[in-house]
Every structure is written in C-alpha cells, then in structure tokens.
C-alpha cells in the first residue's frame, strides 16, 4: 500500500512554542482506544494548557484530554477511525495551536513480549520467538517486527531483521561462538494503519555455544 510519509514520521507541528505530537493505540484496553499527546518542548509551562479533540468522533462533537503529569491522555470507544480529527491546545476557550490528524496514521502498537531464544543443536541454529497482543486485536492485526541483536561487547553494532511473523531463525555460523548476545524486538503497523514503532520489548540475553559444543535451550542470564 502506498502512503505519503514513512512509518514513524511524526506529524509536523505548527512552528510555535506549543508544538506537540500524538500517538493512538487501538483496542488498548478491551474495545477502548487511547490517544496520547505531549509537547515537544519539555520546558513548556503546561499549568493552564488543555488538549481537546473534535471531529471524527461517535455521538459527540469533542472530547477533552486528561492531564497525567507531562502527557495528555484520552481513553474512549468514541473514535470513528475514519476522517480527520482536529486536536487543539487550549487555554480556556482559546485555541493556541491545532493539527488535523487521522488517528489511523499515528498508531503506536504495544510492545512485543515473551521474547525467547532456543538453541537447536542438530540444526545448528537459534529459534527466536516472541508474542504480541495484536494477534488478538480486531483492527491493528498486521505488524512488521524489527528484531535487533548484538554481541554484548559491541555497544552500538546492532543487527536488524524485519519480519512479519513472530518467529525467526538465526544461523549459528552467523554468530560468534562462546559469546553473550542481547536481543530485543519492536513492532510497527503494516496494513492500512500507519504510525510509529512500539517501545522495545524487554531484552533477552543468550550465550552461543563453543564450536562443537552441544547445548540445550539458551538460558536467560
């Protein structure tokens, strides 16, 4: 499917002191959706500032956000999910800045979980598996996953593999023997919905065997 912006591109804000960005999460709490917005400048004095969303809503014209420390948050079933909503920063009744946003283009999936790695001695490979709550969802079901792994001593030398399933095989010969590895995974919408990368899953650590050394399941460290 063609799109206009790369996945992960933030909506650009108006050039003023109240620039903000938002992300949506669909069916994040049962059938409830959420929308989270925050100012891009952490030094903005948010004391009297409120957020409001209007348009592309079911049964209501507008909804107000709740303030949770530095973020603004809505949890609701009332997103129409078609058409553009107008999200405004307000002081009282006055709008300081607004953005037209289609909530289906700013979706941030939930982080994958239960990441694990199993060594298969006979096949000389590692089977990486993980889980995602999106397998049970009705809207954002199709994701692209980014599995990243590195040798623990190579701080910034991550190898990335993109896949659409929740299972990946790493060949032993592609990894250093007797080395400690860190692996993690994140997800991004991949069919119709667009948006941002999820948070990373918790990292999993595993050690590769010595050459010709047999080993069973990789134990987490």
């Amino acid at each position: 499917e063609s799109g206009y912006a790369q996945n992960g591109d933030l909506e650009d804000a108006e050039l003023d002191d109240y620039s903000f960005s938002c992300y949506s999460q669909l069916e994040v709490n049962g059938s409830q959706h959420s929308l989270t917005c925050a100012f891009e400048d952490p030094d903005v004095n948010i004391t009297n500032l409120e957020f409001e969303i209007c348009g592309a809503l079911v049964e209501v014209k507008c909804l107000n956000f709740r303030k949770l420390q530095e973020i603004y948050f809505i949890e609701t079933k009332k997103f129409l999910l078609i058409g553009k909503s107008n999200i405004c920063v307000k002081v009282g009744e006055k709008s300081l800045t607004c953005k037209k946003i289609d909530l289906t283009t700013i979706v941030k999936p939930e982080a994958p979980f239960d990441l694990s790695v199993v060594y298969r001695e006979g096949a000389n490979d590692f089977v990486v598996t993980f889980n995602t709550s999106h397998l049970q969802k009705k809207y954002v079901k199709v994701l692209m996953h980014d599995v990243a792994y590195r040798q623990e001593k190579d701080e910034n030398k991550w190898t990335h593999v993109n896949l659409s399933s929740t299972k990946l095989t790493l060949l032993q010969r592609k990894l250093q023997p007797a080395a400690m590895y860190e692996i993690k995974v994140r997800s991004i919408p991949d069919h119709y919905f667009k948006g941002f990368w999820s948070e990373w899953s918790p990292s999993y650590y595993f050690r590769t065997p010595e050459i010709n050394n047999s080993s069973g399941e990789m134990d987490p460290i």
């Epitope: 206009y4 129409l80 037209k100 809207y139």
Partner: antibody, heavy 118, light 111 residues
Amino acid sequence: QVQLVQSGAEVKKPGASVKVSCKASGYRFTDYELHWVRQAPGQGLEWMGGIDPKTGGTAYNQKFKGKVTLTSDRSTSTVYMELSSLRSEDTAVYYCARSGGRWYFDVWGQGTTVTVSS
Amino acid sequence: DIVLTQSPASLAVSPGQRATITCRTSESVSIHLLHLMHWYQQKPGQPPKLLIYGASNLESGVPARFSGSGSETDFTLTINPVEAEDTANYYCQQSIKDPYTFGGGTKVEIK
C-alpha cells in the same frame, strides 16, 4: 468556503505534455492531501494519485507511474498534475479532489478537460 | 486491484419511492467495524459529490434521505424517498488498498 479551482481546458498534440493546476482555498492547505481522478468521455472514475502538501510526498496508481507527476506549491496553495507523452486515450476530464480521510474525496475541483488530438 | 461491481447499471424510480444500489467488491474492504467504502453522486457536467463515507456516515450537508450500509464485500446505497433532483450517476469507491478503485456507476432516472 472550501474550494478547489482548476486551470482551464487544454488541447494538445500526441506526444506533448500538459500541466494542470488546482488552487485550494478556504482551509489550511497543509491539512489535507490532494488527489487526481480522471474520467474519460462517457466512462467512470479512475484514481491517478495524490500528494501531501505538507511533506510533498506522493502516491501514484501503478498504472500512471511515469505518466503523471504531482507537485505542490505551499506559497500559492496550489497542486499541479503533469501528464507526459500524451496519447488520444488520455483525452478526459481531470479532477483534483481533497481527501477528507483515508482516502475518500470530500471536495472536488470543477474539472479540467484535456483533449489530445492530431 | 480490488474490483467494484455495481448493480443495477441503471434504474428508473418514481418520486417518493425507494432506490437501492448495491456495490460488491472482489475482496473485503472492512477492518473489523471500519468499512472503507464511500459513495458519490455525479450530475451531468459536474464533478462528483461525496454522499456517504465509511459505508454509513452521511457527509455534512447531504440530505438524510441518503443512507448507506454494508460490510466486508457487500454494500448498499439507499435513497428514500427519491426526489426529482436525485437524477444522476452514483459511484462506490474503496479505500482499503491502493489503487483506490471506483465502481462502474449506476444511472438513476426519475420516472
């Protein structure tokens, strides 16, 4: 009020190019993507492609890739559609249309007739 | 490409009666309750006009005698009651997958 005003009718020879403009008014230009839809004489509607005036990013119907180039000018709130290597089959009314959501068209220009004839 | 088949190709309706147009798609254009089907009216010499978006949402300013329904691969546009000014061509359009395709159109005439 929200309006899309297109440039006037064009008559072109086969092999030539044509550039049709669509000027938006009555709303913030960068808030909505603009698309082009063509309608050959007595025929139905065919989506050609769209452009996001905010980023300049484009999306094309594969059928029209290489044939159509979409551009936008934020300073004048105008989008352009250039058709190259014109053939008689390109004779049609070309509409620009605003995308109210993904991807339906809530505001339409009046249409520009392009006639390709030797 | 997703193919949209409209039926009937044309119909004649008396004022005050109901007109029903169907649009069938070659694959589903729904994601759960999000139905990516839209309807337009086009009168001779004019651009199309959006009537219904998301299968059943009435566009602002469109008379309530127009309504839409359906999901997955089968959608319906209903005009009830039909008025003389509803003489036009009607098109369905899907937006789940590029290229965004239209149906072949249904010509509605008022008897």
